[in-house]
Interface confidence: low
């Protein structure tokens, strides 16, 4: 699998992964004890036909061209979890692995 | 996890899974021995904020609102393989499980 990596200086218009630090304090999410911020990353960019297509299915739907199919969009194709320490609704402190919090790779699907 | 299922008569505008039969013969893909057609399905529809969001990450990126982030789009969130019999590039007959050929669920990511 392959995905492009970009930053805020990139001129790349195609589907790419960009750095993004999510700051829970800035959001006012005070129920999150740790981390106060983490590197989440995000996907942005255009999906030209066949570029960075993760699945053969994407190609097949393009071929079949059903009503309402909008073509692929730039979306996470690989994500990873982070461990978090937080208050749950009962004010208990929970330590747990929260899935799909970090974008590792972007692609067109 | 939850995803909407629709058909060609549905009036649903939100992100939904639609039936789609892929016909390899119609595409002229004569290197595929079996199946000649299969039910692939596809995703289509609008992703209003928070509707059918698969990942907390999607919500966080919306909160952080970085440059160029386009908002979530309707894309497969669960896929499954099919078994196929096909000729490879060396004209050998291969029987194998091809991943991510069928859309089982759609969501916004």
């Amino acid at each position: 699998d392959f995905g492009l990596d970009c930053d805020e200086h990139s001129t790349e218009s195609r589907c790419c992964r960009y750095p993004l630090t999510v700051d829970f304090e800035a959001f006012g999410w005070d129920w999150i004890i740790a981390p106060k911020r983490y590197k989440a990353n995000y996907c942005s960019g255009e999906c030209e036909f066949v570029f960075l297509q993760k699945y053969p299915h994407t190609h097949l739907v393009h071929q079949a061209n059903p009503r309402g199919s909008a073509g692929p969009c730039c979306t996470p194709t690989k994500m990873s979890p982070i461990n978090m320490l937080y208050f749950n609704g009962k004010e208990q402190i929970i330590y747990g692995k929260i899935p799909a919090m970090v974008v590792d790779r972007c692609g067109c699907s | 996890d939850f995803g909407l299922d629709c058909d060609e008569h549905s009036t649903e505008s939100r992100c939904c899974r639609y039936p789609l039969t892929v016909d390899f013969e119609a595409f002229g893909w004569d290197w595929i021995i079996a199946p000649k057609r299969y039910k692939a399905n596809y995703c289509s529809g609008e992703c209003e904020f928070v509707f059918l969001q698969k990942y907390p990450h999607t919500h966080l990126v919306h909160q952080a609102n970085p440059r160029g982030s386009a908002g979530p789009c309707c894309t497969p969130t669960k896929m499954s393989p099919i078994n196929m019999l096909y000729f490879n590039g060396k004209e050998q007959i291969i029987y194998g499980k091809i991943p991510a050929m069928v859309v089982d669920r759609c969501g916004c990511s």
Epitope: D5, Y18, P19, P35, Y38, I82, V102 | -
Partner: antibody, heavy 122, light 110 residues
Framework: EVQLVESGGGLVQPGGSLRLSCAVS????????KGWVRQAPGKGLEWIGI???????YYASWAEGRFTISRDNSKNTVYLQMNSLRAEDTAVYFC????????????????WGQGTLVTVSS | AVVMTQSPATLSLSPGERVTLSCQAS??????LSWYQQKPGQPPKLLIY???TLASGVPSRFKGSGSGTDFTLTISSLQPEDAATYYC????????????FGQGTKVEIK
């Protein structure tokens, strides 16, 4: 006890090769980013490279091609293979573990070995 | 590649004084900054990560701040055991995980 222990340092001639080992104990090798950092006598810290959780390796531009990081999960050991050594490679070489900081594969290091001295001289 | 510049090179202060160390990045690194303390003959010790988060077991007199290109490590009340060299470090998890250290600031006790 959670620790990293480097070995394999010593005197080597210019143009020679050396393989450093970093034996880890008290934690699972493959669950953490591992890095190598060096420090020339009286100088600052210099990053060499890392091997991430998936086993992919990344190097400083100056180390690319000459230095290779690998790991053997069964031996709980990370390696640094150094080829075409030069006098300016003389340094203490540290093995370090990425921080388990609730976060995503950060490459700051919260556990370090004591270091092993490599001297390149004829 | 990002370049980290620390100032001053050396600092000599008395116990109890407030210490301010500076680290500047050649381009924006968001919050991706760590601080280390290294004493002679020892490996570095992580003090701060993500610009301001105190690492486990680090005394609360150490405080990190800043984002973007300008970062500061403050020791609110200098203790004799704080005599060491302090390094800032950034890491880039987007483009090939490049890691860069500053050249260090040596803190001496008068």
């Amino acid at each position: 006890e959670v620790q990293l222990v480097e070995s394999g340092g010593g005197l080597v001639q210019p143009g020679g090769s050396l393989r450093l080992s970093c034996a880890v104990s008290g934690f699972t090798l493959s669950h953490y980013v591992k890095g190598w950092v060096r420090q020339a006598p009286g100088k600052g810290l210099e990053w060499i490279g890392i091997i991430n959780i998936e086993g992919s390796t990344y190097y400083a531009s100056w180390a690319e091609g000459r230095f290779t990081i690998s790991r053997d999960n069964s031996k709980n050991t990370v390696y640094l293979q150094m080829n075409s050594l030069r006098a300016e490679d003389t340094a203490v070489y540290f093995c370090a573990r990425g921080h388990d900081n609730f976060g995503y594969s950060y490459h700051d290091f919260n556990l370090w070995g004591q270091g092993t001295l490599v001297t390149v001289s004829s | 590649a990002v370049v980290m510049t620390q100032s001053p090179a050396t600092l000599s202060l008395s116990p109890g004084e407030r210490v301010t160390l500076s680290c500047q990045a050649s381009e924006s690194i968001h919050h991706e900054l760590s601080w280390y303390q290294q004493k002679p003959g020892q490996p570095p010790k992580l003090l701060i990560y993500l610009a301001s988060t105190l690492a486990s077991g680090v005394p609360s007199r150490f405080k990190g701040s800043g984002s973007g290109t300008d970062f500061t490590l403050t020791i609110s009340s200098l203790q004799p055991e704080d005599a060491a060299t302090y390094y800032c470090q950034t890491y880039d998890g987007i483009s090939h995980y490049g890691v860069a250290f500053g050249q260090g600031t040596k803190v001496e006790i008068k």
